[in-house]
Amino acid sequence: HSDGIFTDSYSRYRKQMAVKKYLAAVLGKRYKQRVKNK
């Protein structure tokens, strides 16, 4: 984090949100592909 000025709490929260967003996008893409293939 920025020069130790901040706790690591907010960046940890945001990283977890980013992972969730990425996984949702990947799973959503796979689901769409499966529907399309049917």
């Epitope: 984090h1 920025s2 020069d3 000025i5 901040f6 706790t7 690591d8 709490s9 907010y10 960046s11 929260y13 945001r14 977890q16 949100m17 980013a18 969730k20 967003k21 949702a24």
Partner: antibody, heavy 114, light 113 residues
């Protein structure tokens, strides 16, 4: 000294636009740094507006914002911005920026009135 | 929609009193513990007090403490000092994929009895 300084507030007519700035000093902005905006109407509580990642520029907004406000940043200037459009009387408030919702600026007053 | 209910809205207390403020959240806070507390004095910006429900921010006196998880959280001031008369806000962190990332409680004004 570590600080955030907001500027750009003032009197604006209903329907008008305003851009607020939030300049960071005393520390190096990193990838893990988020600039958030919060407002407080006179005599009321705090209301979250949205945040932007200094690193990737990704943004999140409160649902009520509904496209009227846009948050951006300029890494080279260590500065975040809040662009406010279609302003209404109920947008009258002190607007704060807050780094990672931990370090806060002093606030800038926006008054929407004809 | 998020409901972050803070109580009481006003609290009258004396120096030396033990003071407790509560925040109730619906839905549950992200990971059960991502909740912060702030102190605000008139005309000033909020000051960061507590993060992740119970961790004290740098420079915050040990008379302040936080507890709770999931949907119910408390801020306690063990022995109220003259400098503590102010308004206190909780801030919830949520799963941004389903609701707003953040929501503040309505505030609790701690005034002199």
């Amino acid at each position: 000294e570590v600080q955030l300084v907001e500027s750009g507030g003032g009197l604006v007519q209903p329907g008008g636009s305003l851009r607020l700035s939030c300049a960071a000093s005393g520390f190096t902005v990193s990838r893990d740094y988020w600039i958030c905006w919060v407002r407080q109407a006179p005599g009321k509580g705090l209301e979250w507006i949205g945040c932007i990642s200094a690193g990737g520029g990704s943004t999140d907004y409160a649902n009520w914002v509904n496209g009227r406000f846009t948050i951006s940043r300029d890494i080279s200037k260590n500065t975040g911005y809040l662009q406010m459009n279609s302003l209404r009387a109920e947008d009258t408030a002190v607007y704060y920026c807050a780094g990672n919702l931990e370090i806060w600026g002093q606030g800038t007053l926006v008054t929407v009135s004809s | 929609d998020i409901q972050m209910t803070q109580s009481p809205s006003t609290l009258s207390a004396s120096v030396g009193d033990r003071v407790t403020i509560t925040c109730q959240s619906s839905p549950s806070i992200y990971s059960g513990a991502f909740l912060s507390w702030y102190q605000q004095k008139p005309g000033k910006a909020p000051k960061f007090l507590i993060y992740e429900a119970s961790k004290l921010a740098s420079g915050v006196p040990s008379r302040f403490s936080g507890s709770g998880s999931g949907t119910e959280f408390t801020l306690t001031i063990s022995s109220l000092q003259p400098d503590d008369f102010a308004t206190y806000y909780c801030l919830g962190f949520y799963d941004c994929s389903s609701v707003d990332c953040h929501a503040f409680g309505g505030g609790t004004k701690v005034e002199i009895k």
